[in-house]
Interface confidence: medium
């Protein structure tokens, strides 16, 4: 176009700039080895480094792995982002007792109100549960489960919140009162797929690096990329997303070109020894619990978590023999893989059936 | 299955270049960064750098900068790696790797040996 | 850069003999640590990736564990095959970084 004739001109003589004809303006050639961050930089500030999905530029412009929720007591809050760690919270039903960076160190379930109590403030992810006491005229028997949860036999103490993972506890010494409260939150994750679709599809351009038009000729690639399977962290660093490819971990949330991917233990399993955005092992969950009633879900969380029969009508735990036998799966859609080691260390209850997968493992299935 | 396939060793005298390739096979070539990874004569590994191959996007170790450059050839399916300015502190034998969706340096060329020698 | 500080250099082991590598990051790798296995004239062999997930084919003596800024491989009971030396390294952030290896050679 004539008209465009002199905008065009502005940018001649001028190697820091290009005119850039769909957009019909000048643009800041960004440096090589740096991407633009819009179809038409105006400035340097315009341009950055790229790292691999999974990874995320730093503050100090180094390609750095996002933090993975994989732990099977985190999610995910917010993603992993082109500069910007991803950040993990406590699951429904828990909250953190010993924060870390852009995560949860620990993470306790919720106190439950105990008999005459009611619930004021339902915990968080932030803040365990409040509870006050229940108005005159209410049955201790409490009929409503939303206002009054009464504790079933061998549920957790009251007074005090029950971590998840330990800092110090072996599989063999992770406590197994609250079988119920256990048993109610690995039912709950049966209302997620086990699996999420991996992030790492391997595309062959990085959507959220890539510019909307390629670089001009001649100028060489604009900003910073990352391999798959990294982020480019706050400082423009390429860093590891976290893996869950073991067989105990599945993906919380994807590994992005600016985040790291977070791993949790699969449904059925508690994280024994946490990682950031991961977890270090998983041991299954010390399920005593036969049969749960469906709770209303939760203000403040999506999942849905169950409530635990009347009093009295919890079942004794029994371990399974020591050699692993135990009855066939008869529900194979929905199988949580356990780890074998774990497995000998922590019982797993006959009330949750438990078979052996091709691998060797036990797989305990959720029916 | 996945193979990286390099180039022969070479000799080369001080001052000289050297370009050593690394032909892929069994995978889409431009759907994974190429690594490239020296290892002196008795010495540990140290990461060069490494490439996009879908769009010859480069990122380099600070020490190789002004040492090494990547590029990658698609319709071959071959990436190379240039070494300028040879000196003898440059011999060494030269490894290209890919990585695997979660995996580090899952797959590795058989490696290249350079030598300078005056 | 991270760097990654592995020891010993050198152990001399017997065949049966469980032995431990380890390797120090000069800042928290969040897991992010490989553990490879190198004998003269081949290329390294992936045996450990984030800390403690074993590599395809790897056989289970071989374990991995470690957060933070500390990282072991274990081998339970060193076998004639694995006498080679061993690398760590950490990739949590570019550029990449190995340990300097450890030999494992025969008492």
């Known amino acids: 176009f004539p008209q465009d004739r002199p905008f065009e001109d502005t940018c001649h003589g001028n190697p820091s700039h290009y005119y850039d004809k769909a957009v019909r303006r000048c643009c800041y050639r960004c440096p090589m080895g740096l991407f633009p961050t819009q179809q038409c930089p105006q400035r340097p500030t315009d341009c950055r480094k790229q790292c691999e999905p999974d990874y995320y530029l730093d503050e100090a412009d180094r390609c750095t792995a996002c933090v993975t929720c994989s732990r099977d007591d985190l999610v995910e809050k917010t993603p992993c982002a082109w500069n910007s760690s991803r950040v993990c919270e406590c699951r429904p039903g828990m909250f953190c007792s010993t924060s870390a960076v852009n995560s949860c160190a620990r993470c306790f379930f919720h106190s439950v109100c105990p008999a005459g109590m009611i619930v004021k403030f339902p915990g968080t992810a932030q803040k365990n549960t409040v509870c006050e006491p229940a108005s005159p005229g209410v049955s201790p028997a409490c009929a409503s489960p939303e206002n009054c949860k009464e504790p079933s036999s061998g549920t957790i103490p009251q007074a005090k919140p029950t971590p998840v993972s330990p800092a110090t506890s072996s599989a063999s010494t992770m406590p197994v009162r609250g079988g119920t409260r256990l048993a109610q939150e690995a039912a709950s994750k049966l209302t997620r797929a086990p699996d999420s679709p991996s992030s790492v599809g391997r595309p062959s351009s990085d959507p959220g690096l890539s510019p909307t038009q390629p670089c001009p000729e001649g100028s060489g690639d604009c900003r910073k990329q990352c391999e798959p399977d990294y982020y480019l962290d706050e400082a423009g660093r390429c860093t590891a997303c976290v893996s869950c490819s073991r067989d105990d971990l599945v993906e919380k949330t994807p590994c992005a070109w600016n985040s790291s991917r977070t791993c949790e233990c699969r449904p059925g399993m508690i994280c024994a020894t946490s990682a950031t955005n991961s977890c270090a092992r998983c041991v299954p969950y010390p399920i005593c619990a036969a049969e749960t009633v469906t709770k209303p879900q939760d203000m403040a969380e999506k999942d849905t978590t169950f409530e635990a029969p009347p009093l009295g009508t919890q079942p004794d735990c029994n371990p399974t023999p020591e050699n692993g036998e135990a009855p066939a799966s008869t529900s194979p859609t929905q199988s949580l893989l356990v780890d074998s080691q774990a497995s000998k260390t922590l019982p797993i209850p006959t009330s949750a059936p438990v078979a052996l997968s091709s691998t060797g493992k036990p797989v305990l299935d959720a029916g | 299955q996945v193979q990286l396939v390099q180039s022969g060793a070479e000799v080369k005298k001080p001052g000289a270049s050297v370009k050593v390739s690394c032909k892929a096979s069994?995978?889409?070539?431009?759907?994974?960064?190429i690594h490239w990874i020296k290892q002196a004569p008795g010495q540990g590994l140290e990461w060069i750098g490494y490439i996009n191959p879908s769009s010859s996007y480069t990122d380099y170790n600070q020490n190789f900068k002004d040492k090494a450059t990547l590029t990658a050839d698609k319709s071959s399916s071959t990436a190379y790696m240039e070494l300028s300015s040879l000196r003898s502190e440059d011999t060494a034998v030269y490894y290209c790797?890919?990585?695997?969706?979660?995996?580090?340096?899952?797959?590795w060329g058989q490696g290249t040996l350079v030598t300078v020698s005056s | 850069d991270i760097v990654m500080t592995q020891s010993p250099s050198s152990l001399s082991a017997s065949v049966g003999d469980r032995v431990t590598i380890t390797c120090k990051a000069s800042q928290d790798v969040s897991t992010a640590v490989a553990w490879y296995q190198q004998k003269p004239g081949q290329s390294p062999k992936l045996l450990i990736y984030?800390?403690?997930t074993r590599h395809t084919g790897v056989p289970d003596r071989f374990t991995g564990s470690g957060s933070g800024t500390d990282y072991t491989l274990t081998i339970s009971s060193l076998q004639p095959e694995d006498f080679a030396t061993y690398y760590c390294q950490q990739h949590y952030r570019i550029p990449h970084t190995f340990g300097g290896g450890t030999k494992v050679e025969i008492k």
């Open positions: 069994g995978y889409t070539f431009t759907s994974y960064w």
């Open positions: 984030w800390a403690s």
């Open positions: 790797a890919r990585r695997e969706d979660y995996v580090p340096f899952a797959y």
